[in-house]
């Protein structure tokens, strides 16, 4: 089976790399525009220049193209705690990230929120905080992990998952009480 190609891909595949087929005349291959520019006018004929113009401020193209308009620069989402790592240029979109000692949590493919890295109080760092992952903590005895914080077993209710982790502590306490009553 032949893989299904979109119209644009079909048209481009007829021309050598770095060129595209003229939309009005499929016998002409025009040179694509460099990154940082966009297509203003198709080439008038074979071997003639494509009319490419530089992207205006606030827009970009990151690869060679034959787009009629540049792409709008992304804005970092302040409400999600994002900060600008590098500003938009004609050939590169804005790069957004998080502050020091924070990590990105992706709610979806194109949406992330910045959160503070866990400090592992009442525990030890098992894996350090990374760009896209919070610190992984291991809790000290008598503590259990809840929402990536080490919480005292005294806050463990019977209905919660922590009972498995905190049960040895409870049994130890019982054991010491029992051994004292001989």
């Amino acid at each position: 089976l032949v893989p299904h190609l979109g119209d644009r891909e079909k048209r481009d595949s007829v021309c050598p790399q770095g060129k595209y087929i003229h939309p009005q005349n499929n016998s002409i291959c025009c040179t694509k525009c460099h990154k940082g520019t966009y297509l203003y006018n198709d080439c008038p004929g074979p071997g003639q220049d494509t009319d490419c113009r530089e992207c205006e401020s606030g827009s970009f193209t990151a690869s060679e193209n034959h787009l009629r308009h540049c792409l709008s620069c992304s804005k970092c989402r302040k409400e999600m705690g994002q900060v600008e790592i590098s500003s938009c240029t004609v050939d590169r979109d804005t790069v957004c990230g998080c502050r020091k000692n924070q990590y990105r949590h992706y709610w979806s493919e194109n949406l992330f929120q910045c959160f503070n890295c866990s400090l592992c109080l009442n525990g030890t760092v098992h894996l350090s905080c990374q760009e896209k992952q919070n610190t992984v903590c291991t809790c000290h005895a008598g503590f259990f992990l809840r929402e990536n914080e080490c919480v005292s077993c005294s806050n463990c209710k019977k209905s919660l998952e922590c009972t498995k982790l905190c049960l040895p502590q409870i049994e130890n306490v019982k054991g010491t009480e029992d051994s004292g009553t001989t």
């Epitope: 409400e79 999600m80 949590h105 709610w107 929120q113 929402e147 990536n148």
Partner: nanobody, 119 residues
Framework: EVQLLESGGGLIQPGGSLRLSCAAS????????MVWVRQAPGKGLEWVSH????????YYADSVKGRFTISRDNSKNTLYLQMNSLRAEDTAVYYC????????????RGQGTLVTVSS
């Protein structure tokens, strides 16, 4: 005590419209970014849309872009989600929530309102 009460769900035909509301109390509404998330039957939570404190910055998931509109009325402490051109895949329980602060979980979200899109 934070309270979020969603309303406006129901059974609607494909292509129809619904407007969800979320009445908020127990916190300073004007200081919080508000979120709509949804959970389709047998699936996880999906981030639908959010709106910043003043209603200036909004975000929409690709699946709802151009069809849904989020808004808020700070004088009424109410969040809205206008849903147009509804599709069967929009069937879900819709929850309003405060933007998480401490970590990637929802400390405060409502009980939800069911939207069923079916002919």
């Amino acid at each position: 005590e934070v309270q979020l009460l969603e309303s406006g769900g129901g059974l609607i035909q494909p292509g129809g419209s619904l407007r969800l509301s979320c009445a908020a109390s127990g916190f300073t509404f004007t200081k919080e970014t508000m979120v709509w998330v949804r959970q389709a039957p047998g699936k996880g939570l999906e981030w639908v849309s959010h709106i910043d404190r003043v209603g200036q910055d909004t975000y929409y998931a690709d699946s709802v872009k151009g069809r849904f509109t989020i808004s808020r009325d700070n004088s009424k402490n109410t969040l809205y989600l206008q849903m147009n051109s509804l599709r069967a895949e929009d069937t879900a329980v819709y929850y309003c929530a405060l933007l998480p602060k401490r970590g990637p979980w929802f400390d405060y979200r409502g009980q939800g309102t069911l939207v069923t899109v079916s002919s």
